[in-house]
Interface confidence: low
Protein backbone atom coordinates (compact mmCIF):
# COMPACT_ATOMS: atom_id res chain seq x y z
CA UNK A 1 0.00 0.00 0.00
CA UNK A 2 2.95 2.36 -0.26
CA UNK A 3 1.97 5.22 -2.61
CA UNK A 4 3.95 4.95 -5.85
CA UNK A 5 4.79 8.67 -5.88
CA UNK A 6 6.57 8.32 -2.56
CA UNK A 7 9.13 6.00 -4.18
CA UNK A 8 10.31 8.93 -6.25
CA UNK A 9 12.82 11.31 -4.56
CA UNK A 10 11.17 14.18 -6.43
CA UNK A 11 8.07 13.77 -4.28
CA UNK A 12 10.00 14.39 -1.08
CA UNK A 13 12.25 17.08 -2.52
CA UNK A 14 9.29 19.02 -3.94
CA UNK A 15 7.33 18.70 -0.70
CA UNK A 16 10.29 19.89 1.38
CA UNK A 17 10.97 22.77 -1.00
CA UNK A 18 7.37 23.94 -0.59
CA UNK A 19 7.71 23.75 3.19
CA UNK A 20 11.00 25.63 3.01
CA UNK A 21 9.40 28.32 0.84
CA UNK A 22 6.62 28.77 3.37
CA UNK A 23 9.15 28.91 6.21
CA UNK A 24 11.20 31.61 4.44
CA UNK A 25 8.07 33.75 4.14
CA UNK A 26 7.36 33.66 7.87
CA UNK A 27 7.53 37.19 9.24
CA UNK A 28 7.24 37.80 12.98
CA UNK A 29 4.32 40.16 13.48
CA UNK A 30 5.25 43.33 15.36
CA UNK A 31 1.67 43.92 16.43
CA UNK A 32 -0.06 43.13 19.70
CA UNK A 33 -2.66 40.40 19.93
CA UNK A 34 -6.19 41.66 20.37
CA UNK A 35 -7.43 38.14 21.17
CA UNK A 36 -5.84 35.22 22.99
CA UNK A 37 -6.90 31.58 22.67
CA UNK A 38 -5.19 28.76 24.52
CA UNK A 39 -6.20 25.25 23.48
CA UNK A 40 -5.26 22.76 26.17
CA UNK A 41 -5.21 19.07 25.34
CA UNK A 42 -5.22 17.51 28.78
CA UNK A 43 -2.71 14.65 28.73
CA UNK A 44 -1.96 15.23 25.03
CA UNK A 45 1.68 14.24 24.89
CA UNK A 46 3.53 14.00 21.58
CA UNK A 47 2.78 10.28 21.21
CA UNK A 48 -0.93 11.14 21.53
CA UNK A 49 -0.65 13.84 18.86
CA UNK A 50 1.09 11.43 16.46
CA UNK A 51 -1.38 8.61 17.02
CA UNK A 52 -4.35 10.98 16.68
CA UNK A 53 -2.93 12.33 13.43
CA UNK A 54 -2.79 8.80 12.03
CA UNK A 55 -6.31 8.04 13.26
CA UNK A 56 -7.66 11.26 11.75
CA UNK A 57 -6.11 10.33 8.42
CA UNK A 58 -7.35 6.76 8.55
CA UNK A 59 -10.88 7.98 9.28
CA UNK A 60 -10.60 9.77 5.91
CA UNK A 61 -9.38 6.58 4.18
CA UNK A 62 -5.80 7.81 4.06
CA UNK A 63 -2.77 5.85 5.22
CA UNK A 64 -2.41 8.07 8.28
CA UNK A 65 0.84 9.85 9.12
CA UNK A 66 0.92 12.10 6.05
CA UNK A 67 -2.30 13.76 7.30
CA UNK A 68 -2.22 17.20 8.90
CA UNK A 69 -3.95 17.95 12.13
CA UNK A 70 -5.17 21.53 12.48
CA UNK A 71 -2.53 22.07 15.15
CA UNK A 72 0.16 20.80 12.75
CA UNK A 73 -0.45 23.87 10.58
CA UNK A 74 0.64 26.27 13.34
CA UNK A 75 3.98 27.73 12.21
CA UNK A 76 5.82 27.98 15.54
CA UNK A 77 6.56 25.16 17.97
CA UNK A 78 8.36 24.87 21.30
CA UNK A 79 8.78 22.25 23.98
CA UNK A 80 7.38 22.83 27.45
CA UNK A 81 8.91 21.40 30.65
CA UNK A 82 5.95 20.30 32.72
CA UNK A 83 7.39 19.35 36.12
CA UNK A 84 5.83 20.94 39.21
CA UNK A 85 7.87 22.43 42.05
CA UNK A 86 7.53 19.24 44.10
CA UNK A 87 7.14 16.47 41.48
CA UNK A 88 9.01 15.36 38.37
CA UNK A 89 5.67 14.21 36.94
CA UNK A 90 2.89 16.74 37.54
CA UNK A 91 -0.90 16.83 37.78
CA UNK A 92 -3.32 19.09 35.95
CA UNK A 93 -3.63 21.53 38.86
CA UNK A 94 0.01 22.50 39.20
CA UNK A 95 0.41 22.65 35.43
CA UNK A 96 -2.65 24.87 35.01
CA UNK A 97 -1.08 27.29 37.45
CA UNK A 98 2.04 27.30 35.28
CA UNK A 99 0.57 27.87 31.82
CA UNK A 100 -2.32 30.09 32.95
CA UNK A 101 -0.69 32.09 35.76
CA UNK A 102 2.98 31.96 34.79
CA UNK A 103 4.17 30.55 38.14
CA UNK A 104 4.91 26.93 39.07
CA UNK A 105 3.13 25.46 42.06
CA UNK A 106 2.82 22.21 43.96
CA UNK A 107 1.09 18.99 42.94
CA UNK A 108 -2.74 19.17 43.17
CA UNK A 109 -2.87 22.87 44.08
CA UNK A 110 -4.34 25.49 41.76
CA UNK A 111 -3.67 29.20 41.33
CA UNK A 112 -1.18 29.28 44.19
CA UNK A 113 2.57 29.60 44.36
CA UNK A 114 4.65 26.74 45.74
CA UNK A 115 4.62 28.42 49.14
CA UNK A 116 1.14 26.92 49.50
CA UNK A 117 0.85 23.31 50.66
CA UNK A 118 -1.55 20.70 49.34
CA UNK A 119 -4.68 20.37 51.49
CA UNK A 120 -3.50 22.95 54.04
CA UNK A 121 -6.11 25.69 53.91
CA UNK A 122 -4.13 28.11 56.03
CA UNK A 123 -1.38 28.27 53.40
CA UNK A 124 -3.73 29.75 50.80
CA UNK A 125 -3.92 33.41 51.73
CA UNK A 126 -1.09 35.55 50.39
CA UNK A 127 0.09 32.87 47.96
CA UNK A 128 -2.51 33.48 45.24
CA UNK A 129 -1.22 34.02 41.71
CA UNK A 130 -3.32 35.78 39.07
CA UNK A 131 -4.20 34.16 35.76
CA UNK A 132 -3.78 35.74 32.35
CA UNK A 133 -7.55 35.41 31.95
CA UNK A 134 -8.07 37.55 35.03
CA UNK A 135 -5.59 40.12 33.73
CA UNK A 136 -7.33 40.12 30.33
CA UNK A 137 -10.65 40.84 32.04
CA UNK A 138 -9.11 43.74 33.96
CA UNK A 139 -7.90 45.11 30.63
CA UNK A 140 -11.48 45.21 29.34
CA UNK A 141 -11.49 42.03 27.30
CA UNK A 142 -14.25 39.43 27.38
CA UNK A 143 -13.18 36.06 28.73
CA UNK A 144 -14.37 32.49 28.44
CA UNK A 145 -13.73 28.95 29.61
CA UNK A 146 -14.75 25.92 27.53
CA UNK A 147 -14.05 22.33 28.55
CA UNK A 148 -15.28 18.78 28.12
CA UNK A 149 -14.67 18.13 31.82
CA UNK A 150 -16.40 19.79 34.75
CA UNK A 151 -15.89 23.54 34.58
CA UNK A 152 -14.63 23.23 38.16
CA UNK A 153 -11.94 20.73 37.10
CA UNK A 154 -8.24 21.40 37.62
CA UNK A 155 -7.35 22.83 34.20
CA UNK A 156 -10.18 25.36 33.80
CA UNK A 157 -9.97 26.22 37.51
CA UNK A 158 -6.45 27.50 36.90
CA UNK A 159 -8.04 30.42 35.07
CA UNK A 160 -10.09 31.66 38.02
CA UNK A 161 -9.52 29.74 41.27
CA UNK A 162 -7.05 29.53 44.13
CA UNK A 163 -7.20 26.30 46.10
CA UNK A 164 -4.89 24.01 48.02
CA UNK A 165 -6.92 21.01 46.88
CA UNK A 166 -8.07 20.55 43.30
CA UNK A 167 -10.77 18.11 44.49
CA UNK A 168 -12.76 20.76 46.37
CA UNK A 169 -15.36 21.03 43.60
CA UNK A 170 -18.30 21.98 45.85
CA UNK A 171 -18.54 22.83 49.53
CA UNK A 172 -19.48 19.20 50.20
CA UNK A 173 -15.92 18.28 49.16
CA UNK A 174 -14.26 20.80 51.51
CA UNK A 175 -13.55 19.59 55.06
CA UNK A 176 -15.48 21.51 57.72
CA UNK A 177 -12.22 22.74 59.24
CA UNK A 178 -11.11 24.25 55.92
CA UNK A 179 -14.53 25.84 55.42
CA UNK A 180 -14.27 27.43 58.86
CA UNK A 181 -10.83 28.77 57.95
CA UNK A 182 -12.42 30.50 54.95
CA UNK A 183 -11.37 28.21 52.11
CA UNK A 184 -13.95 28.29 49.34
CA UNK A 185 -14.88 25.48 47.01
CA UNK A 186 -14.04 25.84 43.32
CA UNK A 187 -17.67 26.21 42.16
CA UNK A 188 -18.13 29.18 44.48
CA UNK A 189 -14.92 30.73 43.17
CA UNK A 190 -16.14 30.21 39.60
CA UNK A 191 -18.95 32.71 40.12
CA UNK A 192 -17.36 35.01 42.68
CA UNK A 193 -13.64 35.46 41.99
CA UNK A 194 -14.06 37.23 38.68
CA UNK A 195 -16.56 38.03 35.97
CA UNK A 196 -16.35 35.28 33.34
CA UNK A 197 -18.44 36.01 30.25
CA UNK A 198 -18.70 32.46 28.89
CA UNK A 199 -18.56 29.24 30.92
CA UNK A 200 -19.23 26.03 28.98
CA UNK A 201 -18.69 22.42 30.02
CA UNK A 202 -19.92 19.96 32.62
CA UNK A 203 -20.34 20.29 36.37
CA UNK A 204 -24.01 21.06 37.06
CA UNK A 205 -24.20 19.16 40.31
CA UNK A 206 -21.66 21.34 42.10
CA UNK A 207 -23.77 24.45 41.52
CA UNK A 208 -27.01 23.39 43.21
CA UNK A 209 -28.15 22.48 46.72
CA UNK A 210 -28.23 18.88 47.89
CA UNK A 211 -31.55 17.36 46.95
CA UNK A 212 -31.95 19.40 43.76
CA UNK A 213 -32.85 16.97 40.98
CA UNK A 214 -30.77 17.21 37.83
CA UNK A 215 -32.88 18.40 34.87
CA UNK A 216 -31.53 15.68 32.58
CA UNK A 217 -31.49 12.82 35.11
CA UNK A 218 -34.19 13.79 37.62
CA UNK A 219 -34.65 10.26 38.91
CA UNK A 220 -30.96 9.67 39.59
CA UNK A 221 -30.25 11.06 43.05
CA UNK A 222 -26.48 10.70 42.56
CA UNK A 223 -26.62 13.22 39.70
CA UNK A 224 -28.44 15.89 41.68
CA UNK A 225 -27.09 18.92 43.52
CA UNK A 226 -24.30 18.36 46.02
CA UNK A 227 -24.10 21.68 47.86
CA UNK A 228 -24.46 21.74 51.64
CA UNK A 229 -24.72 25.53 51.94
CA UNK A 230 -28.13 25.57 50.24
CA UNK A 231 -26.88 27.96 47.58
CA UNK A 232 -28.02 27.91 43.99
CA UNK A 233 -24.87 29.25 42.37
CA UNK A 234 -26.48 29.40 38.93
CA UNK A 235 -29.22 31.70 40.19
CA UNK A 236 -26.64 33.81 42.00
CA UNK A 237 -24.63 34.09 38.80
CA UNK A 238 -27.72 34.93 36.72
CA UNK A 239 -28.68 37.66 39.17
CA UNK A 240 -25.28 39.33 38.71
CA UNK A 241 -25.68 40.07 35.02
CA UNK A 242 -28.62 41.57 33.20
CA UNK A 243 -27.87 39.69 29.99
CA UNK A 244 -26.97 36.39 31.62
CA UNK A 245 -28.34 33.11 30.31
CA UNK A 246 -27.98 29.60 31.70
CA UNK A 247 -28.42 26.61 29.39
CA UNK A 248 -28.06 22.90 29.94
CA UNK A 249 -28.61 21.38 26.51
CA UNK A 250 -27.32 21.78 22.97
CA UNK A 251 -30.47 23.32 21.46
CA UNK A 252 -30.57 26.09 24.01
CA UNK A 253 -26.82 26.70 23.65
CA UNK A 254 -27.14 27.21 19.92
CA UNK A 255 -30.08 29.57 20.43
CA UNK A 256 -28.33 31.55 23.15
CA UNK A 257 -25.14 31.96 21.14
CA UNK A 258 -27.12 33.73 18.39
CA UNK A 259 -29.16 35.91 20.76
CA UNK A 260 -27.78 39.48 20.79
CA UNK A 261 -29.35 40.12 24.21
CA UNK A 262 -27.14 37.46 25.82
CA UNK A 263 -23.99 39.03 27.26
CA UNK A 264 -23.01 36.25 29.67
CA UNK A 265 -23.52 32.57 28.99
CA UNK A 266 -23.18 29.58 31.30
CA UNK A 267 -23.79 26.17 29.80
CA UNK A 268 -23.46 23.11 32.00
CA UNK A 269 -24.32 20.06 29.96
CA UNK A 270 -23.73 17.19 32.38
CA UNK A 271 -23.83 16.81 36.18
CA UNK A 272 -20.11 15.93 36.15
CA UNK A 273 -17.72 15.64 33.23
CA UNK A 274 -19.23 15.71 29.78
CA UNK A 275 -19.58 12.40 28.01
CA UNK A 276 -16.80 11.08 25.81
CA UNK A 277 -17.30 12.14 22.20
CA UNK A 278 -18.06 8.54 21.23
CA UNK A 279 -20.85 8.36 23.86
CA UNK A 280 -22.23 11.87 23.40
CA UNK A 281 -25.97 12.29 22.81
CA UNK A 282 -25.73 14.81 19.98
CA UNK A 283 -29.32 15.97 20.51
CA UNK A 284 -28.67 16.97 24.13
CA UNK A 285 -24.96 17.68 24.53
CA UNK A 286 -22.89 19.96 22.29
CA UNK A 287 -19.50 18.87 21.00
CA UNK A 288 -16.33 20.69 21.98
CA UNK A 289 -16.32 22.23 18.51
CA UNK A 290 -19.86 23.54 18.98
CA UNK A 291 -19.07 24.94 22.42
CA UNK A 292 -15.97 26.64 21.04
CA UNK A 293 -17.97 28.19 18.21
CA UNK A 294 -20.66 29.41 20.61
CA UNK A 295 -18.03 30.95 22.87
CA UNK A 296 -16.33 32.73 19.98
CA UNK A 297 -19.62 34.13 18.69
CA UNK A 298 -20.26 35.79 22.05
CA UNK A 299 -16.74 36.83 22.93
CA UNK A 300 -15.88 38.32 19.55
CA UNK A 301 -18.51 41.06 20.02
CA UNK A 302 -16.13 42.90 22.33
CA UNK A 303 -14.12 45.48 20.36
CA UNK A 304 -11.34 45.24 22.95
CA UNK A 305 -10.89 41.56 22.23
CA UNK A 306 -11.11 38.40 24.28
CA UNK A 307 -9.29 35.61 26.11
CA UNK A 308 -10.57 32.06 25.59
CA UNK A 309 -9.48 28.84 27.25
CA UNK A 310 -10.57 25.69 25.38
CA UNK A 311 -9.83 22.31 26.91
CA UNK A 312 -10.06 18.86 25.42
CA UNK A 313 -10.13 17.55 28.96
CA UNK A 314 -11.08 13.94 28.48
CA UNK A 315 -8.06 12.93 26.40
CA UNK A 316 -6.51 12.50 29.83
CA UNK A 317 -9.41 10.40 31.12
CA UNK A 318 -9.20 8.00 28.20
CA UNK A 319 -5.52 7.48 28.89
CA UNK A 320 -6.05 6.96 32.62
CA UNK A 321 -8.44 4.15 31.67
CA UNK A 322 -5.82 2.78 29.23
CA UNK A 323 -8.45 3.10 26.51
CA UNK A 324 -6.53 4.63 23.64
CA UNK A 325 -9.62 4.68 21.42
CA UNK A 326 -11.28 7.15 23.79
CA UNK A 327 -8.18 9.28 24.22
CA UNK A 328 -7.56 9.53 20.49
CA UNK A 329 -11.16 10.25 19.48
CA UNK A 330 -11.18 13.00 22.12
CA UNK A 331 -7.97 14.37 20.61
CA UNK A 332 -9.55 14.46 17.15
CA UNK A 333 -12.56 16.40 18.45
CA UNK A 334 -10.14 18.76 20.19
CA UNK A 335 -8.36 19.25 16.88
CA UNK A 336 -11.70 19.85 15.14
CA UNK A 337 -12.36 22.63 17.66
CA UNK A 338 -8.98 24.17 16.86
CA UNK A 339 -9.81 24.05 13.15
CA UNK A 340 -13.21 25.68 13.66
CA UNK A 341 -11.73 28.41 15.81
CA UNK A 342 -9.23 29.12 13.04
CA UNK A 343 -12.09 29.63 10.62
CA UNK A 344 -13.84 32.04 12.98
CA UNK A 345 -10.81 34.15 13.90
CA UNK A 346 -7.97 35.88 12.10
CA UNK A 347 -4.30 35.22 12.74
CA UNK A 348 -3.80 38.93 12.13
CA UNK A 349 -5.20 39.77 15.55
CA UNK A 350 -5.53 36.47 17.42
CA UNK A 351 -2.69 34.63 19.14
CA UNK A 352 -3.64 30.96 19.29
CA UNK A 353 -1.62 28.48 21.32
CA UNK A 354 -2.09 24.72 21.49
CA UNK A 355 -0.41 22.70 24.20
CA UNK A 356 -0.77 19.94 26.76
CA UNK A 357 -0.47 20.17 30.50
CA UNK A 358 1.43 16.88 30.69
CA UNK A 359 1.92 13.63 28.83
CA UNK A 360 0.95 10.01 29.57
CA UNK A 361 2.90 6.76 29.63
CA UNK A 362 1.39 5.99 26.22
CA UNK A 363 3.57 4.54 23.51
CA UNK A 364 3.28 3.87 19.80
CA UNK A 365 5.72 1.36 18.37
CA UNK A 366 6.44 -2.15 17.15
CA UNK A 367 7.15 -1.41 13.44
CA UNK A 368 3.56 -1.54 12.13
CA UNK A 369 3.09 -1.40 8.39
CA UNK A 370 2.13 1.93 6.85
CA UNK A 371 -1.66 2.16 6.58
CA UNK A 372 -2.32 -0.52 9.19
CA UNK A 373 -4.88 0.41 11.84
CA UNK A 374 -3.54 2.57 14.64
CA UNK A 375 -5.45 0.23 16.98
CA UNK A 376 -4.01 -2.85 15.31
CA UNK A 377 -1.29 -5.37 16.05
CA UNK A 378 2.42 -5.13 15.46
CA UNK A 379 3.75 -7.54 12.81
CA UNK A 380 5.04 -10.81 14.23
CA UNK A 381 4.79 -12.09 17.77
CA UNK A 382 6.34 -11.17 21.08
CA UNK A 383 8.77 -13.49 22.90
CA UNK A 384 5.82 -15.17 24.59
CA UNK A 385 4.58 -16.11 21.09
CA UNK A 386 1.56 -13.85 21.42
CA UNK A 387 0.46 -10.82 19.46
CA UNK A 388 0.81 -7.30 20.83
CA UNK A 389 -0.71 -3.96 19.92
CA UNK A 390 1.24 -1.03 18.52
CA UNK A 391 -0.32 1.17 21.20
CA UNK A 392 0.70 0.29 24.75
CA UNK A 393 0.94 1.86 28.20
CA UNK A 394 3.85 1.73 30.61
CA UNK A 395 1.46 1.18 33.49
CA UNK A 396 -2.26 1.06 34.10
CA UNK A 397 -5.36 -1.11 34.30
CA UNK A 398 -4.58 -2.89 31.02
CA UNK A 399 -2.16 -5.18 32.85
CA UNK A 400 -3.82 -8.59 33.04
CA UNK A 401 -2.45 -11.98 33.95
CA UNK A 402 -4.41 -14.94 32.60
CA UNK A 403 -3.19 -18.22 34.10
CA UNK A 404 0.02 -16.44 35.04
CA UNK A 405 0.64 -15.12 31.55
CA UNK A 406 -0.12 -12.13 29.35
CA UNK A 407 -3.31 -12.68 27.34
CA UNK A 408 -3.13 -12.97 23.59
CA UNK A 409 -4.92 -10.28 21.59
CA UNK A 410 -6.65 -10.25 18.21
CA UNK A 411 -7.15 -7.36 15.80
CA UNK A 412 -10.90 -7.37 16.42
CA UNK A 413 -10.39 -7.12 20.18
CA UNK A 414 -7.84 -4.32 19.96
CA UNK A 415 -10.05 -2.33 17.61
CA UNK A 416 -12.92 -2.16 20.09
CA UNK A 417 -13.62 1.27 21.61
CA UNK A 418 -13.69 -0.37 25.03
CA UNK A 419 -10.38 -2.23 24.66
CA UNK A 420 -7.73 -1.45 27.27
CA UNK A 421 -4.21 -1.56 25.85
CA UNK A 422 -1.85 -3.69 27.88
CA UNK A 423 0.70 -2.30 30.30
CA UNK A 424 3.88 -3.47 32.03
CA UNK A 425 2.78 -2.55 35.55
CA UNK A 426 -0.68 -3.05 37.08
CA UNK A 427 -2.34 0.13 38.39
CA UNK A 428 -5.97 1.11 38.87
CA UNK A 429 -5.32 4.18 36.78
CA UNK A 430 -2.58 4.77 34.23
CA UNK A 431 -0.28 7.65 35.19
CA UNK A 432 0.88 10.89 33.66
CA UNK A 433 4.35 10.99 32.13
CA UNK A 434 7.07 13.54 32.69
CA UNK A 435 8.51 14.21 29.25
CA UNK A 436 8.23 17.61 27.60
CA UNK A 437 5.11 18.44 25.63
CA UNK A 438 4.68 20.51 22.49
CA UNK A 439 3.45 24.09 22.29
CA UNK A 440 2.08 25.16 18.89
CA UNK A 441 1.60 28.87 18.15
CA UNK A 442 0.03 31.06 15.48
CA UNK A 443 -0.73 34.78 15.32
CA UNK A 444 0.78 37.97 16.74
CA UNK A 445 3.96 37.24 18.75
CA UNK A 446 3.75 33.52 18.00
CA UNK A 447 7.42 33.66 16.98
CA UNK A 448 8.30 33.95 20.68
CA UNK A 449 7.24 30.33 21.07
CA UNK A 450 10.54 28.58 20.35
CA UNK A 451 13.11 26.33 21.95
CA UNK A 452 12.73 24.40 25.18
CA UNK A 453 10.94 26.47 27.80
CA UNK A 454 9.46 26.19 31.24
CA UNK A 455 5.69 25.70 31.07
CA UNK A 456 5.29 29.08 32.79
CA UNK A 457 6.63 30.74 29.64
CA UNK A 458 3.26 30.14 27.95
CA UNK A 459 1.40 32.50 30.28
CA UNK A 460 4.09 35.13 29.86
CA UNK A 461 3.94 34.94 26.06
CA UNK A 462 0.17 35.46 26.18
CA UNK A 463 0.45 38.35 28.61
CA UNK A 464 3.19 40.03 26.60
CA UNK A 465 1.46 39.52 23.26
CA UNK A 466 -1.69 41.26 24.50
CA UNK A 467 0.20 43.86 26.58
CA UNK A 468 -1.35 42.60 29.81
CA UNK A 469 0.20 42.88 33.26
CA UNK A 470 3.11 42.80 33.86
CA UNK A 471 3.82 43.73 30.24
CA UNK A 472 1.54 46.74 29.84
CA UNK A 473 4.58 48.65 28.50
CA UNK A 474 5.03 46.00 25.81
CA UNK A 475 5.85 48.56 23.07
CA UNK A 476 3.92 46.58 20.46
CA UNK A 477 1.98 48.37 17.75
CA UNK A 478 -1.78 47.93 18.08
CA UNK A 479 -3.23 45.92 15.23
CA UNK A 480 -4.42 48.11 12.37
CA UNK A 481 -8.12 48.77 12.81
CA UNK A 482 -8.21 47.96 16.50
CA UNK A 483 -11.06 49.79 18.17
CA UNK A 484 -11.42 50.68 21.80
Amino acid sequence: IIPVEEENPDFWNRQAAEALGAAKKLQPAQTAAKNLIIFLGDGMGVSTVTAARILKGQKKDKLGPETFLAMDRFPYVALSKTYSVDKHVPDSGATATAYLCGVKGNFQTIGLSAAARFNQCNTTRGNEVISVMNRAKKAGKSVGVVTTTRVQHASPAGAYAHTVNRNWYSDADVPASARQEGCQDIATQLISNMDIDVILGGGRKYMFPMGTPDPEYPDDYSQGGTRLDGKNLVQEWLAKHQGARYVWNRTELLQASLDPSVTHLMGLFEPGDMKYEIHRDSTLDPSLMEMTEAALLLLSRNPRGFFLFVEGGRIDHGHHESRAYRALTETIMFDDAIERAGQLTSEEDTLSLVTADHSHVFSFGGYPLRGSSIFGLAPGKARDRKAYTVLLYGNGPGYVLKDGARPDVTESESGSPEYRQQSAVPLDGETHAGEDVAVFARGPQAHLVHGVQEQTFIAHVMAFAACLEPYTACDLAPRAGTTD
Epitope: P209, T212, N232, Q235, L238, A244, V247, W248, N249, E252
Partner: nanobody
Framework: QVQLVESGGGLVQAGGSLRLSCAVS????????IGWFRQAPGKEREFVAR????????RYDDSVKGRFTVSIEDAKNTAYLQMSSLKTEDTAVYYC???????????????WGQGTQVTVSS
Protein backbone atom coordinates in the same frame (compact mmCIF):
# COMPACT_ATOMS: atom_id res chain seq x y z
CA GLN B 1 -38.90 28.01 22.22
CA VAL B 2 -40.83 27.05 25.34
CA GLN B 3 -44.52 26.09 25.17
CA LEU B 4 -46.80 25.92 28.20
CA VAL B 5 -50.23 24.29 28.31
CA GLU B 6 -52.47 24.55 31.38
CA SER B 7 -55.17 22.07 32.34
CA GLY B 8 -57.24 21.10 35.37
CA GLY B 9 -59.54 24.11 35.62
CA GLY B 10 -63.27 23.82 36.17
CA LEU B 11 -66.20 24.55 38.43
CA VAL B 12 -65.79 23.87 42.14
CA GLN B 13 -67.69 24.77 45.29
CA ALA B 14 -66.27 27.16 47.86
CA GLY B 15 -64.04 25.27 50.29
CA GLY B 16 -63.20 22.68 47.63
CA SER B 17 -59.90 21.87 45.90
CA LEU B 18 -58.48 21.82 42.37
CA ARG B 19 -55.12 20.91 40.94
CA LEU B 20 -53.93 22.82 37.89
CA SER B 21 -51.21 21.39 35.66
CA CYS B 22 -48.81 23.23 33.38
CA ALA B 23 -47.07 21.01 30.83
CA VAL B 24 -43.82 22.53 29.58
CA SER B 25 -42.44 21.46 26.22
CA UNK B 26 -39.48 22.59 24.17
CA UNK B 27 -37.27 21.57 27.09
CA UNK B 28 -37.59 24.55 29.36
CA UNK B 29 -34.19 25.73 30.42
CA UNK B 30 -33.03 25.26 33.93
CA UNK B 31 -32.89 29.00 34.44
CA UNK B 32 -36.59 29.32 33.63
CA UNK B 33 -38.83 29.34 36.67
CA ILE B 34 -42.54 28.66 36.80
CA GLY B 35 -44.93 31.40 37.80
CA TRP B 36 -48.71 31.17 38.25
CA PHE B 37 -50.90 34.20 37.59
CA ARG B 38 -54.63 34.82 37.42
CA GLN B 39 -56.97 37.34 35.85
CA ALA B 40 -60.49 37.85 37.16
CA PRO B 41 -63.15 39.44 34.89
CA GLY B 42 -62.59 43.18 34.58
CA LYS B 43 -59.37 43.09 36.61
CA GLU B 44 -55.66 43.10 35.79
CA ARG B 45 -53.63 39.95 35.77
CA GLU B 46 -52.07 39.32 39.20
CA PHE B 47 -49.27 37.20 40.59
CA VAL B 48 -50.26 34.05 42.49
CA ALA B 49 -47.09 32.00 43.09
CA ARG B 50 -43.75 31.05 41.63
CA UNK B 51 -41.10 28.38 42.10
CA UNK B 52 -37.55 28.22 40.79
CA UNK B 53 -36.88 25.24 38.54
CA UNK B 54 -34.76 23.50 41.18
CA UNK B 55 -37.20 24.13 44.01
CA UNK B 56 -34.77 26.24 45.98
CA UNK B 57 -37.04 29.30 46.08
CA UNK B 58 -40.84 29.50 46.34
CA ARG B 59 -43.04 32.55 46.83
CA TYR B 60 -46.81 33.04 47.24
CA ASP B 61 -49.02 36.09 47.14
CA ASP B 62 -50.42 36.85 50.59
CA SER B 63 -53.96 36.20 49.36
CA VAL B 64 -53.22 32.51 48.67
CA LYS B 65 -50.56 31.75 51.27
CA GLY B 66 -51.37 28.58 53.19
CA ARG B 67 -54.04 27.54 50.70
CA PHE B 68 -52.12 27.12 47.43
CA THR B 69 -49.01 25.03 46.80
CA VAL B 70 -46.83 25.18 43.69
CA SER B 71 -44.67 22.21 42.72
CA ILE B 72 -42.55 21.08 39.79
CA GLU B 73 -42.13 17.52 38.56
CA ASP B 74 -38.96 17.60 36.50
CA ALA B 75 -39.38 14.09 35.16
CA LYS B 76 -42.68 15.05 33.53
CA ASN B 77 -41.66 18.63 32.67
CA THR B 78 -44.82 19.69 34.46
CA ALA B 79 -45.64 22.28 37.10
CA TYR B 80 -48.65 22.08 39.39
CA LEU B 81 -50.75 24.51 41.41
CA GLN B 82 -52.62 22.71 44.17
CA MET B 83 -55.48 24.95 45.30
CA SER B 84 -57.47 24.15 48.46
CA SER B 85 -59.94 26.04 50.66
CA LEU B 86 -61.06 27.84 47.54
CA LYS B 87 -63.03 31.09 47.85
CA THR B 88 -65.38 32.76 45.38
CA GLU B 89 -62.79 35.52 44.94
CA ASP B 90 -60.38 32.91 43.52
CA THR B 91 -62.56 32.77 40.38
CA ALA B 92 -60.34 33.73 37.43
CA VAL B 93 -58.47 32.49 34.39
CA TYR B 94 -55.21 30.97 35.69
CA TYR B 95 -52.04 31.21 33.62
CA CYS B 96 -48.66 29.57 34.05
CA UNK B 97 -45.55 31.29 32.75
CA UNK B 98 -41.82 30.60 32.42
CA UNK B 99 -39.62 33.42 33.64
CA UNK B 100 -36.12 34.47 34.55
CA UNK B 101 -34.67 36.71 37.19
CA UNK B 102 -32.33 39.60 36.53
CA UNK B 103 -31.02 41.98 39.12
CA UNK B 104 -31.83 44.97 36.95
CA UNK B 105 -35.38 44.05 36.03
CA UNK B 106 -36.43 41.53 38.65
CA UNK B 107 -38.68 38.68 37.53
CA UNK B 108 -39.65 38.66 33.87
CA UNK B 109 -41.85 36.06 32.22
CA UNK B 110 -41.11 35.38 28.58
CA UNK B 111 -43.44 32.48 27.86
CA TRP B 112 -47.12 32.15 28.76
CA GLY B 113 -49.77 29.46 28.57
CA GLN B 114 -53.24 30.08 27.12
CA GLY B 115 -54.91 29.94 30.54
CA THR B 116 -57.49 27.69 32.21
CA GLN B 117 -60.77 28.88 33.76
CA VAL B 118 -61.41 28.27 37.47
CA THR B 119 -64.87 29.10 38.79
CA VAL B 120 -65.62 28.89 42.50
CA SER B 121 -69.34 28.92 43.31
CA SER B 122 -70.92 29.60 46.66
Amino acid sequence: QVQLVESGGGLVQAGGSLRLSCAVSGRALSDYNIGWFRQAPGKEREFVARKTWDGSSTRYDDSVKGRFTVSIEDAKNTAYLQMSSLKTEDTAVYYCAAGRYSRARGWEYDYWGQGTQVTVSS
